[in-house]
Interface confidence: low
């Protein structure tokens, strides 16, 4: 998270770290008790690595009494990701079993109306994301709010020149933005998942490159096929 | 029409300092980055820096830290580039250059001499 | 620092050939790898963006690939005007920064 701040510990318990070998590779956030939802891009970083997901954490490194670590029994990213593009960039990872819920650990609500959100709704957006120019990566979560941009803006050529679909969402990227490590991690307006952080290598901090969203409300169908 | 179009070539002596100016037409540089980049003959690209002209932010690579400076004055729609206690390494054609995701577009080049 | 290594510094075709240059980084750039040519007392010129986005203007027969580490700008049915030379670049996502491949040029037999 750029331009953001060190989150209230444990205040998101719906915020999972998907991790390989040990580190922290993207944000993810719990949809259900046993299932959290990340990006499908995730998982190519992944390579031939044991995939994990961290729950109830606020310090990566540090021990704290809610923090545990998931094996996956299933990863399901979405049948129409594709590598070389953004669309789709959904996964489901089941966990080896249900999560201990607690007020560390906690399934957020997410959005099936499929409507736009508001422009200029601001939103929250947390991760382990990388926070400086040198790509200094945090132990401890952060967040940034920020507003979410109309899609004709995001749009124009000088933007994302057109690349943005009707299940994508922009929120603004002026200094304060999502970035590397933050990719699966949730928007969250209203206290509804509304988005998730696509893993494209898009530039970020740049006014003139917004964040790019998933809208979950349109994936609403796929979501509950595999929850079921 | 998209045009970059920089200054005159530049005969300077070791230790002094240059201004290389690039000035824009066809669009407006506030909604762009512009860019710095040297060739020194019969040699490879190597890349400057940037700067995003609507708020003067600057990123440099390292290896230029010091020895450039890059402005840009958005009245007039052009962006420089300073060097200093120039050497004989420094002799070189500069280009700058327009775009994020790639440079889409480049000036023609000052050649800089730096000769005694 | 990311290294963007141009192992061919020649490389010699004919008119008519596909000629594929390549590059390889020196770790995971995703797709964040421009191509340029640069003829002979010219400026350079964009060919690519993002590893395989053509800029308008630039003939089909040009193409690039890859992503990760390694890419490829692929030349079909060459054409005399080809004769220049191929560098490619990657930019970091954050805070842009830029390194240049050392250059690949090409000869046409």
């Known amino acids: 998270i750029l331009g953001g701040r060190e989150a209230e510990a444990h205040a998101r318990p719906y915020m999972a770290s998907v991790q390989v070998n040990g580190e922290h590779l993207c944000g993810g956030v719990l949809v259900a008790e046993q299932w959290v939802l990340s990006a499908a891009h995730c998982l190519e970083d992944a390579a031939d690595g044991k995939v994990q997901v961290l729950l109830g954490a606020h310090s990566l490194s540090q021990p704290e009494p809610s923090k545990r670590l998931y094996d996956v029994l299933r990863a399901v990213p979405h049948p129409d990701s594709r590598p070389d593009t953004i669309d789709h960039d959904l996964l489901l990872l089941q966990l080896s079993e249900k999560a201990t819920l607690g007020p560390a650990v906690r399934p957020l609500p997410w959005q099936r109306v499929d409507r736009d959100v508001e422009p200029g709704t601001l939103c929250d957006v947390a991760g382990w994301g990388i926070v400086s120019h040198a790509g200094r990566r945090p132990d401890r979560l952060q967040h940034v709010l920020l507003p979410v941009l109309d899609r004709a803006t995001c749009n124009r050529r000088t933007h994302h020149d057109g690349a943005i679909t009707q299940r994508m969402m922009c929120a603004e990227s002026n200094r304060r933005d999502s970035c590397k490590g933050d990719s699966g991690g949730p928007l969250v307006c209203g206290g509804v998942l509304e988005g998730v952080v696509t893993s494209g290598s898009r530039v970020c901090g740049n006014r003139k490159k917004p964040g790019i969203y998933t809208r979950v409300a349109s994936y609403a169908a796929w979501i509950d096929s595999v929850l079921a | 029409e998209v045009q970059l179009q920089q200054s005159g070539a530049e005969l300077v002596r070791p230790g002094a300092l240059v201004k290389l100016s690039c000035k824009a037409s066809g669009f407006n540089i506030k909604d762009y980055y512009m860019h710095w980049v040297k060739q020194r003959p019969e040699q490879g690209l190597e890349w400057i820096g940037w700067?995003?002209?609507?708020?003067?932010?600057?990123i440099y690579d390292p290896r230029f830290q010091g020895k450039a400076t890059i402005t840009a004055d958005t009245s007039s729609n052009t962006a420089y580039l300073q060097l200093s206690s120039l050497t004989s390494e420094d002799t070189a054609v500069y280009y700058c250059?327009?775009?994020?995701?790639?440079?889409?577009?480049w000036g023609q080049g000052t050649l800089v001499t730096v000769s005694a | 620092d990311i290294v963007m290594t141009q192992s061919q510094k020649f490389m010699s075709t004919s008119v008519g050939d596909r000629v594929s240059v390549t590059c390889k980084a020196s770790?995971?750039?995703?797709?964040?790898v421009a191509w340029y040519q640069q003829k002979p007392g010219q400026s350079p010129k964009a060919l690519i963006y993002t590893a395989s986005y053509r800029y308008s203007g630039v003939p089909d027969r040009f193409t690039g690939s890859g992503s990760g580490t390694d890419f490829t700008l692929t030349i079909s049915n060459v054409q005399s005007e080809d004769l220049a030379e191929y560098f490619c670049q990657q930019y970091n996502s954050y805070p842009h920064m830029y390194t240049f491949g050392g250059g690949t040029k090409l000869e046409i037999k």
């Open positions: 250059s327009r775009g994020l995701l790639g440079f889409a577009y």
């Open positions: 770790q995971n750039v995703g797709t964040n």
């Open positions: 700067i995003d002209p609507e708020n003067g932010h600057t």
